[in-house]
Each structure stands twice: as C-alpha cells, then as structure tokens.
Interface confidence: medium
C-alpha cells in the first residue's frame, strides 16, 4: 500500500501478485466523513495508473476492471477531486505481473580443490519479474542434507561452505534447486555425483626444471600437486611459438623427464591435474614456468663467400662474408667465428678470431694457392669449418652465365634468369647469384649479399636487402671444381624517372671537339637503373629543337666527346638522364664557344 | 576460550514444539559452525543438523528433516534448533557442538568445542 491511506482504502482482487494475462478488480472506497467537504455527491474519485487517468467516478466509491498489464510493477492511485480545490491523494497501491519460475536447468556443482568448497550453479530460466526464492540442496551418504536459500534477484549460483571429503569417493551426493515465488515453483531435476565427479583439483605449483649436466638431454620438471591426484597433462613450446607440446602422465608423483627439447631455446611449461582416468575434471593449468635450455655445440656449418680485389702488380685483398647460423644451428649465443687463412703450398696458416661481424678483409700476394676456412664457436663447442680455396670467380670464360636478365617481381624482389654456360652445362656444381648496392665509386663497404642455387635451377628470386627505386648490380656465377664464369647485370625491384640529371662540372676543348665530363646523379636521386645519359645542346637564343647524343650507361664513365659543334658558335648545354620509367628533368645549363677554325 | 551453553530443553507432549538454543563465545561468528547432536540412553551420540552461522547453509538428517529447523543470528553469535511435531523417539539429552571448518561429515570427532548439553523429554 502507498502513503497512509487515512481518508480511504484502495483493494486489489484477487491479490496484489498476479499471472501474466490475468485480470484485477481495484476498489478505491472513501472512509467515513473524508469526502468533499459539503457536498458529498459532488465526490469525484479518479483512478490514476502511474501519472495517467484511468477511470473516475462520482460517489463514495470507485471500481475498476484492469487488464493487460505489463511484466514488472504497476503503481495504482486513488485520488479525490472537490470543487475548487486541487486533487487530494486518497490511497494507492503496487500490483506485481509476473511469471511462476521455470524449471531450473543444468544444475551443476564443483569443489575447487580437496580443501574447498562445494559450489553449484544452474539457469534460472526466463525472468519471473518477481520476488523469487531458491534453495540449493544436497544429500549426501548417511542420511546427511545440506540445504541453503539465495534471496538474490538474480540468483543462479551458491556456495554451500562445505567441504566435501575423500573419506569416500565413490559415495553418491544428490543436488537439487528449488524457485519458489507467489505464483507457483518448480524443482530442477537432481544431479548425482561422487565426490571425484565434483571434485577440481588446484592447478599445480612451485614448477621448477632442472638440466643434469647443463645437458639439453637430460631434463626434468618437477611439481607440486594435492595428495589425491593421479593424472598430470604437461603441456610446453618454444616462447615464440603458439603451438603447445602436449604429454599426459599417471602417477607422476610431481616429477616428469622430458626428451625433446631444444638446446638454447626460452620454453614455457604448463601443467593440469586430474583425480581420476575417466571422473572429474581437469584443474586449470597452473601458472607458466619459462626457462631457457642449456647450450649445445653448433650443428651445420656456415654460407661462407668472397670477393678478390686487384690491389697492384703483387698484392690481393680478399673479402670474407658469412651468413649467421640459423638458431637451430648455432644452438647457443655464437661468441665468435674462427677464421683460418692457408697458404696451401707453403702450409702457412693464419688464424684469428672474430667477434661481432659477418665479414673479415686481408691482403694477400697474388701468387700462392690460398685456402680459408671458417667456423662458428658458442659457449659449448664450434661448427664444422666451411673451407673454400680462393681463386679467379670470373677467370673461366666459357663457364660464365649466359643471357642473364634482371626482372621486377613484385614489391622488393628481382627475378633473376639465365642460361647455362655454353661449356658443358653438366660440368656447372651450383650457381651463385650475388648482389650490391650500385655505387659509382665501387666502393668496397657496401655489404654483400647472395644466395646459393642448385646446378639445374637457372632462375632465382632475390628479396633479402632489397630496396625500391636502388639500382642493384646482381652477378651471377657458375661454380664447377677450382674454376668459376661468372656474368653481371644491373637490376632493380621498383622505379621510375631520376629526380634530377647530372651536373655538367667542365667542358674542354680538344682538337676540334669538345669534353664534356659530368658529376653522377645521387644514388638516392636515380631511381633506379640509369640506362642511358643524353646530352642536348642548341645554339643559344635559337628557337630550334637541340640536338642530342644519348650514350648508354656505364657505371664508371663521367665524361664524353661531342664533335658536331661548329666554332664560334656558342652553345647551350645540359643533361638527363633516363631509367626505364622515363626521363629526368634538366641539369644545369652550360654555354661553350669552340674556339678551333671552322672546317 | 571458546564457550558453549544451551539452553530450552524440558519436558513436552507428542506433537509439540520446544526451541533450543546455543549461544557461543570466544570464537568470531564469521568461522564459525554449529551442529546439534543428540544421544539417548544406551545409544551412541547422533548428528541432528548443524548450520554455518555466516553462510546459513543448513544439514539435517533424515529423521528430522521437516519437522526440525536450524537457524542462527550472527550478531548475537547464537544458533537455534526449532524443534515441531515431536516424537517420543526424540527425547534425548541435546548437545551443541561448533567448529571452525565445514566439511561434509556426520562425525562427532569433527567438532572441537562441546556444550554442557539439555535434556528434551517427549512424553504424555
């Protein structure tokens, strides 16, 4: 009821709690001597539902029939209306529409570890829109029952506080949900289980590993677990890796050996426990353990290549490179490579350790049979040495590569293609594409890059270290026994038009033609391949088209002769430069008189 | 030191009601746990029902279920055994019993603390 209702009463038939659908008869009647003051027939009582008018009546007392009301609560008010004077609060009262609950379904109960407690959970059903009661029971082995109610409104879980013992873990427990409202209840239907049906154990703790002779090999993982369980999953992979070794083990007693792992590799491990082979349920995985596994000596061996550099009549420099082991191979932090130089006439050896690079550059005599070798050392041991003798890459003419090409092959890749060499291909032992930056100076600093390729193959993708819009020079070797061919082409992943064209630095004069030499466009302006450089030229304050002399380009040229001026006559002259995308823009201008007598 | 005194026993017709009580001390209502236990002469001590005063998870045994109620006030740290529809069969001497863990038991030995106990006669 609402407010104090001193001047009537509001009734609500048949009660205050009702079905969905169903109907209500309210009765708002006036007390004695609480009308109008004067005119007690002039009593004008209003039925309000929530703030709207639903009905009115002039007398004593006021009945109405109310259907259709909603789920949820519906607040009735009975007011007086007198002549002249406002509206009068009589009386009022709450009506509740809702549902008797449905059968509480998949009721289901677990005890997180042997020491917790039994908690059950279930699915109300759909909203009752009412006040509704459930009560939890369990009965269990000695006419023993425990029951336990939950006022919550929304009460689809409880816990019992009780802990369920081993004493006997084939005795048979029985749970039951009520839901109890005004309108009527409804009991799930019983869930029976053992104690090892319920029963969850706690993950697993204090996961320790241990390697018995820093040894890879010899590797245990220990635990600790509750007393009763009997079943244990592992489950490990490398930190890197999202797919999990699994293992399952009985009676583990919290220790397990494991035999596959790799050397040197962060692992994280993880483990469940299980009361019992086919009962129960599986813990949740225990909190992870990473650790890292011991070192093992080096396996494989290193991509050993070079490069021979004519210094003068008598002395050589050779460029070593190496590519890292892959982390199986080194199969352990590489603390430095062992290089080994050999003269292999004279027997003389020269070894020296490297730390911190991939490369090693010396100057050796021209003469001699030279041999290196080179190896990769970790904390446990060293690789197998890669030895190669050092001889002319390209001294073998009839072995060289024929009709290689140097295509786009999407973002960042060059497809490289060629033709055996005309020698009998079956000779060729493998092929190796190498390729740089091109750099106008030759410069020996720019790294080094190649791949190795099987003697049948004649095309290879290359990708690694590959820029857009850099002009690459990629060479190509056919490799068989002490001798190589080798053949070169310039290439690119991606390009187009030079930012700008070379700068003309002079122009001289030489026996009726001119020189001109030139400064090489920035390699970060080139774009590309240069293909070609063209030099235009026009009499200067001439309307006429120029004149142009394109020349192919090569990477070590810087200037060219021009004998088609005629003398004292000056000109005007500039350069572009073009790679397959198009052509550049200007260069500076230059003007020129050859001073020399007309022919 | 933990205390336990009941209290409510007395003599009463077949079909009547009496209510028990066991008020506790020294021991925080929170951890607290209590069991009815009953023993007639010549019989061994019974488990009748127990209650957790924090949680209010009740427990009877089949004989009483429905006929008895356990319940408890954790203000007052007191547990209540109502006891309706009596039978000659349930006079005994009622003891109250509490302990500090919840297990699954119809043992005794789990108790740790012990009233004085108070004698139910159901006679006409």
């Known amino acids: 009821k609402i407010d104090a209702c001193k001047r009537g009463d509001v009734t609500v038939k048949p009660s205050h709690v009702i079905l969905l659908g169903s109907t209500v008869n309210i009765t708002c009647s006036l007390k004695p001597r609480q009308g109008c003051f004067h005119y007690s027939r002039r009593n004008k009582l209003i039925l309000y539902k929530f703030d709207r008018r639903i009905n009115f009546h002039h007398g004593h007392s006021l009945n109405s029939q109310v259907t259709g009301l909603p789920l949820g609560t519906t607040l009735f008010v009975c007011k007086l209306a007198c002549i002249n004077s406002d509206e009068i609060q009589i009386c009022g009262a709450e009506i509740f529409v809702g549902v008797a609950p449905e059968q509480p379904q998949n009721l289901s109960c677990i005890q997180k570890g042997e020491q917790g407690t039994v908690a059950c959970t279930w699915e109300r059903g759909r909203d009752t829109h009412l006040y509704t009661e459930y009560t939890l029971q369990l009965s269990g082995p000695k006419n023993l029952t425990w029951q336990k109610q939950c006022k919550d409104i929304y009460c689809d879980y409880l816990d019992f506080g009780i802990n369920l013992t081993p004493e006997s873990p084939e005795s048979n427990f029985t749970a039951k949900v009520t839901a109890v409202n005004s309108l009527g209840s409804s009991s799930s239907l019983p869930s029976t289980f053992t104690f090892l049906d319920i029963v969850r154990p706690l993950p697993p703790w204090d996961i320790r590993i241990k390697f018995q002779k820093a040894s890879v090999s010899r590797c245990t993982l220990y635990w600790r677990d509750e007393g009763l369980v009997l079943l244990n999953r592992l489950r490990y992979r490398p930190s890197n890796s999202r797919l999990w070794n699994m293992v399952n083990v009985t009676k583990a007693k919290g220790r397990h050996d494991l035999l596959d792992l790799k050397p040197f590799t962060e692992y994280e491990f993880q483990i469940s426990s299980k009361l019992h082979l086919y009962k129960g349920s599986w813990s949740d995985w225990s909190e992870s353990l990473r650790a890292q596994t011991p070192e093992e000596e080096p396996t494989g061996m290193l991509d050993v290549w070079y490069m021979k550099r004519h210094i003068d009549y008598s002395r050589q420099q050779i460029s070593l490179f190496w590519k890292n082991l892959s982390v199986s191979e080194a199969r352990g932090k590489i603390l430095h490579y062992q290089v080994t130089l050999q003269e292999l006439t004279g027997g003389k050896a020269m070894t020296q350790n490297i730390t911190g690079h991939t490369s090693w550059t010396t100057v050796i005599p021209r003469t001699g049979n030279w041999a290196v070798a080179v190896s990769a050392a970790n904390s446990k041991g060293s690789s197998l040495p890669t030895r190669i003798n050092i001889m002319n890459l390209c001294e073998a003419g009839l072995l060289a590569p024929r009709q290689v090409s140097a295509n786009s092959e999407g973002m960042d890749n060059i497809l490289v293609t060629w033709q055996p060499p005309r020698k009998d291909p079956s000779a060729v032992q493998e092929y190796v594409v190498e390729w740089r930056e091109l750099h106008p100076g030759g410069d020996t600093q720019v790294p080094l890059n190649w791949l190795r390729s099987r003697p049948y193959n004649v095309s290879a993708l290359i990708s690694e270290n590959i820029k857009s819009y850099i002009c690459y020079e990629i060479r190509v070797y056919a490799l068989s026994g002490d001798q190589g061919g080798c053949s070169s082409i310039l290439g690119n992943s991606k390009h187009k038009a030079p930012l700008s064209g070379p700068h003309i630095n002079a122009i001289t004069e030489e026996k009726g033609s001119i020189l001109i030499s030139w400064n090489s466009i920035p390699v970060q302006e080139q774009m590309g391949c240069l293909l070609h450089y063209r030099i235009y030229w026009k009499e200067r304050d001439s309307n006429s088209q120029p004149q142009l002399c394109e020349i192919p380009y090569r990477v070590s040229q810087n200037s060219h002769p021009i004998n088609s001026l005629q003398p004292r006559v000056t000109y005007v002259l500039w350069m572009t430069a073009l790679t397959a995308a198009g052509e550049s823009s200007h260069g500076n201008e230059r003007e020129f008189c050859l001073q020399g007598k007309a022919n | 030191q933990v205390q336990l005194q009941e209290s409510g026993g007395g003599l009463v017709q077949p079909g009547g009601s009496l209510r028990l009580s066991c008020a506790a001390s020294g021991i925080s209502s929170s951890r607290l746990h209590v069991g009815w236990f009953r023993q007639s002469p010549g019989k061994e001590r019974e488990f009748v029902a127990a209650i957790s005063l924090s949680g209010g998870t009740q427990a009877y045994t089949d004989s009483v279920k429905g006929r008895f109620t356990i319940s408890g006030d954790n203000v007052k740290n007191t547990a209540y055994l109502q006891m309706n529809s009596l039978r000659p069969e349930d006079t005994a001497v009622y003891y109250c019993?509490?302990?500090?863990?919840?297990?699954?038991?119809?043992?005794?030995?789990?108790?740790?603390?012990w009233g004085q106990g108070t004698q139910v006669t159901v006679s006409s």
């Open positions: 019993a509490a302990r500090e863990r919840f297990i699954w038991t119809w043992s005794d030995l789990t108790y740790d603390y």
